[in-house]
Interface confidence: low
């Protein structure tokens, strides 16, 4: 069998064998090599010379196999937009950003561009857990039975009601969705409003 042609090679049907690593150059009707991630085209291919690639300069990157004649400029995560860095820019990857704690992504264009403060969840509710932190605003759900949450907060979680007996105490008032159980010492007298029921 004939050896596979290496770029540059003629292509009559305007397609190249390896779409990821080659591209069709229409002026000469040839397939040429793309440049690997972290590099850019320093000299275009011709019919007798393949693409010449060079490494991206500091503070610039190209993420994919490309035929770009420049590298993309690294951009910092903009704290004014509520973003913080989770991984630095490299020649092969742009700066990785996420929303700062307590914020969610309010504007998305291939990546998050603007974060806003998460809404508070009122007492008796908590924010529904999401697969990915910072992806959307809070959706508040009621505390499940036996739990309470007593603040207005974007991040507070519902806590289980205190079990008085575990502390050697007795329940003075039951817990609600917004408040914990009230416990008392079993030797303490009943509150005055309850003592009348005990008269003989």
């Amino acid at each position: 069998s004939q050896p596979q042609a290496v770029p540059p090679y003629a292509s009559e049907n305007q397609t190249c064998r390896d779409q990821e690593k080659e591209y069709y150059e229409p002026q000469h009707r040839i397939c040429c090599s793309r440049c690997p991630p972290g590099t850019y085209v320093s000299a275009k291919c011709s019919r007798i010379r393949d693409t010449v690639c060079a490494t991206c300069a500091e503070n610039s990157y190209n993420e994919h196999w490309n035929y770009l004649t420049i590298c993309q400029l690294c951009r910092p995560c903009d704290p004014v937009m509520g973003l913080e860095e989770i991984a630095p820019c490299t020649s092969k990857r742009k700066t990785q950003c996420r929303c700062q704690p307590g914020m969610f992504c309010a504007a998305w264009a291939l990546e998050c561009t603007h974060c806003e403060l998460l809404s508070d969840c009122p007492p008796g509710t908590e924010a529904e857990l999401k697969d990915e932190v910072g992806k959307g605003n809070n959706h508040c759900v009621p505390c499940k039975a036996g739990h309470f949450q007593n603040t207005s907060s974007p991040s507070a979680r519902c806590q289980p009601h205190t079990r008085c007996e575990n502390q050697g105490l007795v329940e003075a008032a039951p817990g609600t969705a917004q408040s914990d159980t009230t416990c008392k010492n079993p030797l303490e007298p009943l509150p005055p409003e309850m003592s009348g029921t005990m008269l003989m």
Partner: antibody, heavy 118, light 107 residues
Framework: EVQLVESGGGLVKPGGSLRLSCAAS????????MSWVRQAPGKGLEWVGR??????????DYAAPVKGRITISRDDSKNTLYLQMNSLKTEDTAVYYC?????????WGQGTLVTVSS | DIQMTQSPSSLSASVGDRVTITCRTS??????LNWYQQKPGKAPKLLIY???SLQSGVPSRFSGSGSGTDFTLTISSLQPEDFATYYC?????????FGQGTKVEIK
Amino acid sequence: EVQLVESGGGLVKPGGSLRLSCAASGFTFNDAWMSWVRQAPGKGLEWVGRIKTKTDGGTTDYAAPVKGRITISRDDSKNTLYLQMNSLKTEDTAVYYCTTDYGDYEYWGQGTLVTVSS
Amino acid sequence: DIQMTQSPSSLSASVGDRVTITCRTSQSISRYLNWYQQKPGKAPKLLIYGASSLQSGVPSRFSGSGSGTDFTLTISSLQPEDFATYYCHQSYSTPPTFGQGTKVEIK
């Protein structure tokens, strides 16, 4: 059909200046590196210089015998290549061709004669 | 600069002859060598690029071979319209350089 048409040649005295033009059509001019090649009467071919595309920086390279005396430029909006020649010498007498530069010189103009003589 | 040495500088041949022109470079240029044909009063015409690739529209009697420093242009059966001057040209490095030419004349 690709066409390259040079103009601007003529008789000029030593030390004089001349600007040659090359009008291009039939291909994507702003995607092409372009070169000037010259040929003295009865002699062989000699590369003069080249200009790259704007996307490749629009930079120029010149042959040693003409460096500092010539400037190659391009106007992509007019599909035109230029060769500005200053401080001309008798040894610059030649037919000047513009060519597409893809590593090889695929397309050539008909040439324009520059004669440097007192 | 890379020096190009073409030989012979001229040759006489008859129609139907097989003609071979050689080009030697002062350093290795891989396969970045091109061949041109020029007739009097006309611009050069590209025949072969990349040492052995035939330019579109050029008759198949023209062929090129070689790599490194030694290259050959062959005309398998010389035709009347082939009487011209032939130049080799390297595009491996700047400045590009040409051979001095080989004039093919009628015997």
